[in-house]
């Protein structure tokens, strides 16, 4: 009685059950009722990442510099090579196809948080008593001076893209 | 951005060492990290490298069985298995895949002598 | 893998050029993972070129590199007295386990 299901990592060819090839390993031949399925490794640039009968091996992705990826990790016969983004700049897919540089947060915004490989930048507006007259990627908003802590008193008022301006306190005559 | 190597010193031959690597505004989660080596007097030879994600390690034919790479968040540590006079170098740390973008520490010196 | 560069010494004059070989017995990853690197006495190495041919950051373009494949070029058009050093190419590969450098190639400048 022909079988009409395999055990895993087998699968079913002409009623018969066949040994499946390894992850790094493609179909040559199935098995008949005299041999065992043949397989041969996968070529350099090549994987597969499961247990297969594929007559092909996928080649590894390819992450171009001109798109702003960069080799986070080579791949092997059994992985697929991950992409990620060169510094200052981050992936605009979960694949990581290509890359935009990271934003900058504008004067009188603050980076919330710093972007990475995968992530934007994220920014948040400076609250009262805080300030930020740059635009970046890395700072955050800064705090007002305190004019009191140094003896001396605010002459002009702090804005969300200005700090405070101190001067002396005025002398009684 | 930096790198700084330490734990070169004198040692006697046989005697186990480990040389860490020591990384700052580096995610050692995105980059693969290797390690080269120069005799006094001669040429860069590499030694191995650790993967990014997976922490695989790769190492030169003539170095397998010589060092161990391995790493945790901020360091890269390489071990000399069983030091001999040949050993003798400076070794240094390298961020990336050889070939592409590299940064390189300022290397520390091992002396190998009975 | 084994890199073969232009034995050394190698002569230049200021103002001239130079040029260095590398040659690679196997194809390197992505056909460009070559680099070059300057190294002065006592000095850790300084990249000059990536991926073969993309100049590194702060470094002079009188450096150029080109070559795919198997067979690289270092080239140093008007030469200073500052670029005599000690060049090396280095290759990366499929397998890790086959990277390597070139032996080195000095440049005297005369």
């Known amino acids: 009685e022909p079988p009409t299901a395999c055990r895993e990592k087998q699968y079913l060819i002409n009623s018969q059950c066949c040994s499946l090839c390894q992850p790094g390993q493609k179909l040559v031949s199935d098995c008949t009722e005299f041999t065992e399925t043949e397989c041969l490794p996968c070529g350099e640039s090549e994987f597969l990442d499961t247990w297969n009968r594929e007559t092909h091996c996928h080649q590894h992705k390819y992450c171009d510099p001109n798109l702003g990826l960069r080799v986070q990790q080579k791949g092997t016969s059994e992985t697929d090579t991950i992409c990620t983004c060169e510094e200052g700049w981050h992936c605009t897919s979960e694949a990581c196809e290509s890359c935009v540089l990271h934003r900058s947060c504008s004067p009188g915004f603050g980076v919330k948080q710093i972007a990475t490989g995968v992530s934007d930048t994220i920014c948040e507006p400076c609250p009262v008593g805080f300030f930020s007259n740059v635009s970046s990627a890395f700072e955050k908003c800064h705090p007002w001076t305190s004019c009191e802590t140094k003896d001396l008193v605010v002459q002009q008022a702090g804005t969300n893209k200005t700090d405070v301006v101190c001067g002396p306190q005025d002398r009684l005559r | 951005q930096s790198l700084e190597e330490s734990g070169g010193r004198l040692v006697t031959p046989g005697t186990p060492l480990t040389l860490t690597c020591t990384v700052s505004?580096?995610?050692?989660?995105?980059?693969?990290m290797g390690w080269v080596r120069q005799a006094p007097g001669k040429g860069l030879e590499f030694i191995g490298i650790i993967t990014s994600n997976s922490g695989d390690t790769y190492y030169a034919t003539w170095a397998k069985g010589r060092f161990t790479i391995s790493k945790t968040s901020t360091t890269v540590d390489l071990k000399i298995t069983s030091p001999t006079t040949e050993d003798t170098a400076t070794y240094f740390c390298?961020?990336?895949?050889?070939?592409?973008?590299?940064?390189w520490g300022p290397g520390t010196l091992v002396t190998v002598s009975s | 893998a084994v890199l073969t560069q232009t034995p050394s010494p190698v002569s230049a004059a200021v103002g001239g050029t130079v040029s260095i070989s590398c040659q690679s017995s196997k194809t390197v990853y992505y056909n460009n993972y070559l680099s070059w690197f300057q190294q002065k006495p006592g000095q850790p190495p300084k990249e000059l070129i990536y991926?073969?041919?993309t100049l590194s950051s702060g470094v002079p373009s009188r450096f150029k590199g080109s070559g795919s494949g198997t067979q690289f070029t270092l080239t140093i058009s008007d030469v200073q007295c500052d670029d005599a050093a000690t060049y090396y190419c280095a290759g990366g590969y499929n397998s890790d386990s086959d990277n390597t450098f070139g032996g080195g190639t000095e440049v005297v400048v005369k």
């Open positions: 390298v961020r990336g895949y050889i070939g592409a973008p590299n940064l």
């Open positions: 505004g580096i995610d050692l989660s995105r980059y693969a």
């Open positions: 991926y073969a041919s």
